[in-house]
Interface confidence: low
């Protein structure tokens, strides 16, 4: 029959033959030599009192005689050993000369062929009656993953033969498959921790440890769930797993008590316009609970203001908010506060920010347009709009003039300095309508355009115009 043994120190340069796949470190390479006295097991017994899967008797095409059944010899059924030990076991088979076609022996584990990192060696012992084949299998420094059912397969005369399984059981210290997880909990609120470890050997018993002291006097069978009624301060929990091989301790996990967040820091102004301020901040410590939202508090910094605070709410991320609908050329104090499920943080330090000057809020008034036929120009006049301080300093005007005639459309604009309240524009097209609009410009931007004033440019000397800042859809007053 077959044998199994555990070995501590074995050179892996044993003999290898046949097309059996496997892999070894290159400095331990067996060489093919079917006959050698080195490191051979004694030839197996030919008797088959415990045959495994058997190749049925077959009739050969030449001699027409019945071939005897072939099976793997009975081998050891169960190997128990400790982790990191070496193990060696084998399958053996006796094949009479009457069998013509045989393939190499392949090793299988739990139904899958072992093509990988395992050491397998096949040895042949021929005699007058046939050949005895021993397939040796060895695993150096066994691990838990080597646990399982191993067996040999071989094809004889196109029939597959399977050996009895050899069950390898690797025993070691308990192995954690579930360790307690770090959690953040509300003060004085119950929570659960789970610990699960396995052998072999079983059973595995669990002790819980809180801040270096055992929680349970009697061990619990794995898996174990510890219900903690509540904590008032941070604690460290771990679990001990015990079996016959010894003890393994899980990682220690911190259980934190949720508190309100720390105030945000580094509040900065990224950009200012006349009516908005873009503010950023760095969130403070979240208090072991995710930040849910933030509040931006804005108050006018001028002494004359009534001190009322505007509040703008936003999501906790991104740490950025554009405060809108602010007055132009105004000073504001800004602070940020954020909240988690426990509550609001204190506000950040207040910072000062200013909006820039705005664009004018009203258009120029009293617009008149007159055609100077002798010079072929339009004479445009207006009065300065009432510009507030926050609208900024007047820098000039933009005059938009649109010319329309049959088949022609021309849109033009001019900018003039703030000094005057009149401008002259050359006539672009005769026999056309010209629509004039004017807007005031400050450093803050361009204000609204005035209502359009229309004037008809005749072919010759006739002209109609509208001396008004109100809409003039057609010919109004005649000149």
């Amino acid at each position: 029959g077959g044998t199994a043994e555990k070995w501590e120190e074995t050179e892996l340069d044993q003999l290898f033959s046949g097309p059996l796949p496997g892999r070894l470190p290159v400095n331990h390479r067996p060489f093919s030599a079917p006959h050698s006295s080195r490191d051979q097991l004694p030839p197996p017994q030919t008797g088959r009192s415990h045959p495994a899967h058997t190749a049925a008797p077959q009739v050969t095409s030449t001699a027409s005689k019945l071939l005897p059944p072939v099976a793997f010899n009975h081998t050891i059924g169960h190997i128990v050993l400790s982790e990191h030990k070496n193990v060696k076991f084998n399958c053996s088979i006796n094949i009479p000369n009457t069998y013509q076609e045989t393939a190499g022996i392949s090793w299988w584990k739990d139904g899958k062929e072992l093509l990988g990192a395992h050491h397998s060696i096949t040895q042949f012992y021929p005699d007058e009656e046939g050949v005895s084949i021993i397939a040796l299998f060895s695993i150096a420094s066994v691990q838990r993953s080597d646990n399982g059912s191993y067996f040999c397969k071989m094809k004889v005369n196109n029939r597959e033969i399977v050996s009895d399984p050899i069950y390898v059981e690797v025993q070691g210290l308990p192995y954690f498959i579930k360790q307690p997880e770090s959690v953040n909990v509300t003060r004085n609120t119950a929570f659960n921790l789970t610990c699960q470890a396995v052998g072999p050997p079983e059973p595995v018993n669990i002790f819980w440890v809180q801040n270096s002291s055992r929680v349970n006097e009697k061990p619990e069978r794995s898996p174990s769930v510890l219900t903690v009624p509540g904590l008032t301060e941070t604690a460290v929990f771990s679990c001990e797993a015990h079996n016959d091989k010894g003890l393994t301790v899980s990682k220690g996990v911190h259980i934190n008590i949720k508190v309100i967040p720390s105030p945000p820091t580094e509040v900065h102004i990224l950009n200012s316009t006349a009516h908005s301020i873009l503010v950023s901040w760095v969130p403070g410590f979240d208090g072991y609970s995710p930040l849910q939202n933030c509040s931006i508090q804005v108050k006018e910094a001028d002494r004359l203001s009534n001190g009322s605070v505007m509040v703008f709410n936003t999501s906790a991320s991104p740490h950025l908010y554009e405060i809108q609908q602010l007055q132009a050329l105004a000073n504001y104090s800004i602070a940020v506060s954020c909240r988690n499920e426990i509550g609001w943080s204190a506000v950040s330090p207040w910072i000062l920010a200013s909006t820039t000057e705005g664009a004018p809020s009203v258009a120029p008034l009293n617009i008149t347009v007159f055609l100077n036929e002798s010079n072929n120009i339009l004479d445009i006049r207006w009065t300065k709009p009432p510009i507030k301080r926050q609208d900024g300093e007047l820098v000039g005007y933009r005059i938009s003039h649109v010319w329309e005639s049959a088949g022609t459309y021309k849109e033009l604009s001019e900018e003039v300095s703030q000094n005057g309240s009149w401008a002259q524009i050359p006539v672009q097209i005769h026999n056309a309508t010209c629509t004039v609009r004017i807007a005031a410009i400050t450093k803050g931007g361009i204000g609204p355009f005035s209502e359009p004033v229309n004037i008809i440019i005749p072919e010759h000397s006739k002209v109609d115009y509208a001396p008004s800042s109100t809409p003039a859809p057609g010919n109004t007053d005649s000149m």
Epitope: F16, A103, A117
Partner: antibody, heavy 121, light 107 residues
């Protein structure tokens, strides 16, 4: 001397299948694993799988549903069938013989000339 | 699966220079490593097997070294016929994997 002969090119339509051949000569065909390797244009090498005439096949998981490896011992020829072809399968496919030094040293001392598979409608 | 990380991806060198290509395995492959050379439009050619052994007919200016997870291929006094792509490959079980390759170009 040891040789692995492969046809030069195959043009196939998307969704179709193609069966590539690799004829071995100069060594005992039944004693060695035959491997198949893919190389897309301008790319590196990808191992598809291997077949031993007397033992069985072993596939790269990535190609399990794409490639089927077979052998014809009588003609010392290895085959690889590629199914449900797409443009991703356009590549040069090599067969390669493992080294003679040992049965588990799966590196390749002899390569086929490669078959260029073009998948195009 | 074992990943093979090869560097550099490309190298521009002159004839007569010495170059070193490295290959890192994602786990110990116990010297089960081969190096190949491939020229444009040709099949790969075995250069080195078992990390350090030169294949038949490969010039002695090629040498392989390394163990564990780190391996390298050195080419002394580069010749014009040495330009092309180089690949490492592990054979420590299946699936076999190759490095992404190093392209050696003439400067």
């Amino acid at each position: 001397q040891v040789q692995l002969q492969q046809p030069g090119a195959e043009l196939v339509k998307p969704g179709a299948s193609v069966k590539l051949s690799c004829k071995a000569s100069g060594y005992t065909f039944t004693s060695y694993w035959m491997h198949w390797v893919k190389q897309r244009p301008g790319q590196g090498l990808e191992w598809i799988g291997m077949i031993h005439p007397n033992i069985n096949t072993n596939y790269n998981e990535k190609f399990k549903s794409k490639a089927t490896l077979t052998v014809d011992i009588s003609s010392s020829t290895a085959y690889m069938q590629l199914s449900s072809l797409t443009s991703e399968d356009s590549a040069v496919y090599y067969c390669a013989k493992r080294s003679p030094y040992s049965n588990y040293d799966w590196y390749f001392d002899v390569w086929g000339t490669g078959t260029t598979v073009t998948v195009s409608s | 699966d074992i990943q093979m990380t090869q560097s550099p991806a490309s190298l521009s060198v002159s004839v007569g220079e010495t170059v070193t290509i490295t290959c890192r395995a994602s786990e110990n492959i116990y010297s089960n490593l081969a190096w190949y050379q491939q020229k444009q439009g040709k099949s790969p050619q075995l250069l080195v097997y078992a990390a350090t052994n030169l294949a038949d007919g490969v010039p002695s200016r090629f040498s392989g070294s390394g163990s564990g997870t780190q391996y390298s291929l050195k080419i002394n006094s580069l010749q014009s016929e040495d330009f092309g792509s180089y690949y490492c490959q592990h054979f420590w079980g299946t699936p076999l994997t190759f490095g992404a390759g190093t392209k050696l170009e003439l400067k």
